[in-house]
């Protein structure tokens, strides 16, 4: 007799979910030699642990402790990029900027990168069926409960000048629900934060407006200062011209031609 | 338009140290590259150091480890410390200012001297 399984509203496991975990672990702390001493073994279990065998919609950050425990990482403070609805090009970004780092930089936010997890209460399978989706199922779901805390523990070792670039292109630049919105912004430390500075991606080639100028970015501008850390504000209107900009700093549309 | 005011050059012993600062102003909305460059008398304008935020920053050889440039965006202002300075320093800086991220043309201050005497 097959066993009733529940439907989620979203997506299932990636396929192959715990072989990608693995292969990715090996590979980053191949390519990163501070962090050679990871047992990608051991991460792989503490990764299992936080949601198998536990009802998908009851996960909490503290099942995740063993993972988090493993996968501390020390990045420079001062040289954190946050994103918002801008996934690409800020990882495009640091590709070129190498001694800058975003979430997905870290051990634990390359591993879990766009993959989908989740598992079913008393039993050691893992769902690839389906997973509960965070606004039509529950909140407390394995990948966001993931996300917010890997992404509270980012947010809360930055310090000096943060920097996030968010898309110009949305109906809110700035969204108070998204994870750098919900989450990030508010664990910011202002002991040790001086700048948040927004970096607003225009998607318009010929769009000149100064969005720094939106409501949706006052707003961030509100709650950063109420935070008692000062708030700055840039355009970048063509983002292909920044990232030339970026790759080659000796390029004549780049610097000041004498 | 944007305006560009200079401050902090003068006369310094061979070793000492200095902080130029350069704030700009008017209409400012797009990420932009600050810096500085110098010229000797009877030499060339030659490039010191330009910075378009945090980390990313670019010196020239003769001048790195000795000369650090910072940015404070919310402000627009840059500034240079030079320490361990070197006679072969003294010049006229001059701060210059582009926005890089659409085509803008490039606007530079009148210069500040600096004189490094042995």
């Known amino acids: 007799v097959p066993r009733w399984r529940q439907q989620w509203s979203g997506p299932g496991t990636t396929k192959r979910f715990p072989e990608t975990v693995l292969a990715r672990c090996v590979k980053y702390t191949e390519i990163h030699p501070e962090m050679r001493h990871v047992d990608c073994q051991s991460v792989w279990d503490a990764f299992k642990g936080a949601f198998i065998s536990k009802h998908p919609c009851n996960i909490t950050e503290e099942d995740y402790q063993p993972l988090m425990k493993l996968g501390t990482q020390t990045v420079p403070c001062n040289k954190i990029l946050l994103w918002s609805r801008i996934k690409d090009l800020a990882h495009q970004f640091t590709q070129v900027q190498r001694d800058m780092f975003t979430l997905e930089d870290t051990l634990l936010g390359y591993l879990a990168d766009d993959l989908t997890w989740c598992g079913e209460f008393n039993t050691s399978k893992i769902n690839y069926q389906s997973c509960p989706d965070w606004r039509k199922d529950c909140s407390n779901n394995p990948v966001s409960v993931f996300w917010k805390t890997v992404s509270r523990r980012f947010a809360e070792a930055a310090c000096d000048v943060v920097h996030v670039m968010l898309n110009g292109s949305r109906s809110k630049i700035f969204d108070k629900n998204s994870t750098f919105g919900s989450v990030e912004v508010h664990n910011l430390q202002p002991e040790k934060v001086q700048t948040l500075e927004a970096w607003v991606i225009h998607g318009g080639r010929e769009d000149s407006r100064d969005l720094c100028q939106d409501p949706t970015i006052k707003e961030l501008e509100s709650i950063i200062s109420k935070r008692n850390i000062q708030f700055s504000c840039k355009n970048i209107y063509r983002p292909d011209k920044f990232l030339q900009c970026v790759k080659n700093p000796e390029d004549s549309s780049c610097t000041s031609e004498i | 338009q944007v305006q560009l005011v200079e401050s902090g050059g003068g006369l310094v012993h061979t070793g000492g140290s200095l902080r130029l600062s350069c704030a700009a102003s008017?209409?400012?909305?797009?990420?932009?590259?600050m810096g500085w460059y110098r010229q000797a008398p009877g030499k060339q304008r030659e490039l010191v150091a330009t910075?378009?935020?945090?980390?990313?920053?670019r010196y020239a050889d003769s001048v790195k480890g000795r000369f650090t440039i910072s940015k404070d965006n919310a402000k627009n202002t840059v500034y240079l410390q030079m320490n361990s300075l070197k006679p072969e320093d003294t010049a006229v800086y001059y701060c210059?200012?582009?926005?890089?991220?659409?085509?803008?043309?490039?606007?530079w201050g009148q210069g500040t001297q600096v004189t490094v005497s042995s």
């Open positions: 210059t200012f582009k926005e890089i991220t659409r085509d803008s043309r490039s606007y």
């Open positions: 910075i378009i935020s945090g980390t990313m920053t």
């Open positions: 008017g209409s400012i909305s797009g990420l932009n590259t």
